[in-house]
Amino acid sequence: DSSKWVFEHPETLYAWEGACVWIPCTYRALDGDLESFILFHNPEYNKNTSKFDGTRLYESTKDGKVPSEQKRVQFLGDKNKNCTLSIHPVHLNDSGQLGLRMESKTEKWMERIHLNVSERPFPPHIQLPPEIQESQEVTLTCLLNFSCYGYPIQLQWLLEGVPMRQAAVTSTSLTIKSVFTRSELKFSPQWSHHGKIVTCQLQDADGKFLSNDTVQLNVKHTPKLEIKVTPSDAIVREGDSVTMTCEVSSSNPEYTTVSWLKDGTSLKKQNTFTLNLREVTKDQSGKYCCQVSNDVGPGRSEEVFLQVQYAPEPSTVQILHSPAVEGSQVEFLCMSLANPLPTNYTWYHNGKEMQGRTEEKVHIPKILPWHAGTYSCVAENILGTGQRGPGAELDVQYPPKKVTTVIQNPMPIREGDTVTLSCNYNSSNPSVTRYEWKPHGAWEEPSLGVLKIQNVGWDNTTIACAACNSWCSWASPVALNVQYAPRDVRVRKIKPLSEIHSGNSVSLQCDFSSSHPKEVQFFWEKNGRLLGKESQLNFDSISPEDAGSYSCWVNNSIGQTASKAWTLEVLYAPRRLRVSMSPGDQVMEGKSATLTCESDANPPVSHYTWFDWNNQSLPYHSQKLRLEPVKVQHSGAYWCQGTNSVGKGRSPLSTLTVYYSPETIGRR
């Protein structure tokens, strides 16, 4: 409605004697700013005077006079939108209606607010969820319709009169919509909290009690049970009787069904609070409990471990591990069901008692072949001695033993012979399945454990065999001692160490790598001619003519071996040098004359030097000196020098004659 002033504030505010009241308020005037404000208590409209009558708690006028009551009542608003009020302290007789008379230049309005002031602090209100279940977190809320800036309060939670240790969250609201103080407590109730009293206590700033609210907790929970057993230690012997009783200490709501469980499995037709077990057997040993259900769910008692004692049953032996490898460790375990556990064991190997072995386990750190056989045991406890079971078989496996390689041939063996060998052994577990031979070769194995070497090599020195099952055992190698002709015969120069120069003393050695038998003879030859019968061939002063192809021979009783031909090279400085001229030693001027330096040298001449009749060196280094065009003044004697790594040699002088051409003669 556009003809109304618009106000927003709580409809009713609550307080108690001596507290205060804070009234949040907003407004919007029809036109212009607020010019006059009066706060009435229980205002009544007077038709005669057309004014409101009633107690004036506050007045704001143009002349600015303030009644004494205004010290208690404060207008905290302004001229256009805020109309907040505060009354401090508030009294019981302030209860009723507050009237806010507002006037602008042209408009007037009366706004009414209810104030409820009680004689004593009113109690807060506890709010609980509709259902509380054990161990499920719930939020407890304590609400008080009061909050005032000038009067601080606190809300405290108590359980059975004792402050609760959980932290509460307190919030306040002082808005145009609502005024309250609220405390929220998060809490996980246990079944033991059922029926307990929870209190929310209102206190002033000093912790002084003002008022409270209480509720009784209704905590839904599964049945809580206690189990009792006779005899109390739950240890009996076969044939004894046992009684178990189930007692319900708490259930909310009431329980509906009862059952008994053994080792987690329900026992059929046992639906009472007492379980009677008559003439128990060892199979009835186990963990017992009772289970009682209500609408929340099943509750279980603690478990009772019923032990039915009996003498050991026939034993079995477990072997870790069989088959066992010789040298490994083995453990035997005697397994016998008994209660109480056996205290003594007797062990047997192949039916014979093993002395000093009284434990559940027998450990053999290093197994030998003789440990193989049947192992059995007997267990004993306070109720008696068990029977010996069937036993377990230990299989001890080992590599073949005492392996030998045997030569079947008559001795001595010669290179090229066929040799037969056999591989023998003493014992083996498991059986030998194959054989190996060292060194490897393209050899025949005509039957298992037999080796045939066709055309035996000179270097087949030793042979070894292995007999193999899961492992291979090698025999010591046997020497074939093959006899053969001398091998790797070669000529070796032992003097001089470097290249051979003409005039050097030279020694050649006839080397061979091996011979069996060792006794040998030597022969030297050059170009098919026998030179000597020693291992060395000596030259006191070598000459170029001694160069050529040399061979040596070495023989023993088996045969004869020749070296490769070895070339003896003699190095010497250039010799027999001469200058040859082409086309001849007489050449016509203007033509071409080629001088060639001929020589005999080893190694060949690396470079040449040319000289004229005045022994002046000419700047040429090749074997041929070409003069083109040749001139008459080039006539004269020329000589050459040849150089190799050994030395130098020089030619005698050769004369070149250059004669005039007919043209030159004609011009003269």
Partner: antibody
């Protein structure tokens, strides 16, 4: 310290004669241990030895086969210089021409002049 | 005519690097081989004669080796002034012949 200084025209017409002279200072053209060489360089042929003259009791000449029919190298003892004449030139003879001293015992070109660019063009 | 073949024809390297240039003759030239360095616009300069003899004034980082048909020029640690073109030349047979050159460039 031996120095070589070259002179001659930088442009020659085809079929004419190319003439260059090389002045020697610090040594004699008649030295018994040196030889005096002409070498040219072009992008197409690289470095190319043309010929030499030297004195050992008498004067000798050696020429490259590629120019033997067109080349003459002469010493001038009075001016201590040596010259190059190359007849019947073609654009193929366009190159930088160098004179160089060759010294014994290794017969390498140890001293070179700065070179002259000769262009054969009409 | 003796052919002289150089390899590689060009090589890129950095200051401080070691560089090797090879020269092969088509015929045995004994030790009659020289190496030259040429910078743009200048005449070649003799570095090594007789295959391995260093010319006076040439830095010791340059060295030559070889005999017969195969020869090598080695620069042990390149300096900025070494970037140039290098030529080999045989002096045993007429006509004297040069290699085609190896251009050494900055990487």
């Amino acid at each position: 310290q031996v120095q070589l200084q070259q002179s001659g025209p930088g442009l020659v017409k085809p079929s004419q004669t190319l003439s260059l002279t090389c002045d020697i200072s610090g040594d004699s053209v008649s030295s018994n241990s040196a030889a005096w060489n002409w070498i040219r360089q072009s992008p197409s042929r690289g470095l190319e030895w043309l010929g030499r003259t030297y004195y050992r009791s008498k004067w000798y000449n050696d020429y490259a086969v590629s120019v033997k029919s067109r080349i003459t190298i002469n010493p001038d003892t009075s001016k201590n210089q040596f010259s190059l004449q190359l007849n019947s030139v073609t654009p193929e003879d366009t190159a930088v021409y160098y004179c160089a001293q060759e010294i014994e015992p290794h017969d390498a070109f140890d001293i070179w002049d700065q070179g002259t660019m000769v262009t054969v063009s009409s | 005519v003796i052919q002289m073949t150089q390899s590689p024809s060009s090589v890129s390297a950095s200051v401080g690097d070691k560089v090797t240039i090879t020269c092969r003759a088509s015929q045995d030239v004994s030790g009659w081989l020289a190496w030259y360095q040429q910078k743009p616009g200048l005449a070649p300069q003799l570095l090594i004669s007789g295959a391995s003899s260093l010319q006076g004034g040439v830095p010791s980082r340059f060295s030559g080796s070889g005999s017969g048909t195969d020869f090598t020029l080695t620069i042990s640690s390149l300096q900025p002034e070494d970037f140039a073109t290098y030529y080999c030349q045989q002096a045993k047979y007429f006509p004297y012949t040069f290699g085609q050159g190896t251009k050494l460039e900055i990487k």
